[in-house]
Interface confidence: medium
């Protein structure tokens, strides 16, 4: 029986050229998390495997950074990044839990000055 719940950052917005953290948290279950997949619509962004660590898809490696935690940081945002993002928790013995985040990237007159941040 799947008892867990996922809390996410929900519907979020950011400016073109900026950065954003996508975050999910799985609670209310003792199941072991074996892997977390981050997907945008049908594209795989990144995988965090309990044994193998992080893998960032080659097409996103310049703009995606792992963390914090099991979250994902997107940098140098473009309007094309607008859309649905999913955190998919693979657990044992429960199975799969999925959280949804909707990101809207907005045009800005100061977008060229958009800050980036680093995760130490």
């Amino acid at each position: 029986m799947m008892t867990g719940t996922i809390e996410t950052t929900g519907n979020i917005s950011a400016e073109k050229g900026g950065s954003i953290i996508l975050q999910c948290h799985l609670s209310s279950t003792t199941a072991q998390v074996t892997q977390v997949n981050w997907e945008q619509q049908d594209q795989l962004l990144a995988i965090c495997n309990a044994d193998l660590g992080w893998h960032i898809s080659p097409s996103f490696k310049d703009r995606v950074a792992p963390g914090p935690g099991l979250g994902l940081t997107l940098q140098s945002l473009t309007v094309n990044d607008t859309g649905e993002y999913f955190c998919i928790y693979h657990t044992y013995p429960d199975g799969t839990y999925t959280g949804r985040i909707f990101l809207e990237v907005l045009e800005s007159s100061v977008a060229e000055h958009g800050a980036r941040f680093q995760i130490p």
């Epitope: 950052t9 929900g10 979020i12 400016e15 954003i20 953290i21 996508l22 609670s27 800005s108």
Partner: nanobody, 113 residues
Framework: EVQLVESGGGLVQPGGSLRLSCAAS??????MGWFRQAPGKEREWVAS???????WYADSVKGRFTISADNSKNTAYLQMNSLKPEDTAVYYC?????????WGQGTLVTVSS
């Protein structure tokens, strides 16, 4: 218009404590975070909190800083203990785990004897 107002900074001796506050107006946020920028350095992420109370910290502050949020006041806090000179920076809060340009004024934290 969304506004984020940071406060609580100041001068403190190494080993001391400060509590920063970030008051948000405009709407309720499910995710808030703190960032900092030291002189001559890139702005870096410090900590984040989800509305349900789940928290994440940069390794450099883990065990010393505590982030929290009062949903009824739409305010986020950063309790900073065992401060070190390398914590000296302007601290900014951000909504939704990201930010809009331009940033707010931030609040300056100086750790020095």
């Amino acid at each position: 218009e969304v506004q984020l107002v940071e406060s609580g900074g100041g001068l403190v001796q190494p080993g001391g404590s400060l509590r920063l506050s970030c008051a948000a107006s405009g709407r309720t946020f499910s995710f808030m975070g703190w960032f900092r920028q030291a002189p001559g350095k890139e702005r870096e992420w410090v900590a984040s909190v989800l509305r349900g109370g789940y928290t994440w910290y940069a390794d450099s502050v883990k065990g010393r800083f505590t982030i929290s949020a009062d949903n009824s006041k739409n305010t986020a806090y950063l309790q900073m203990n065992s401060l070190k000179p390398e914590d000296t920076a302007v601290y900014y809060c951000a909504k939704d785990g990201g930010w809009f340009d331009p940033w707010g004024q931030g609040t300056l934290v100086t750790v020095s004897s």
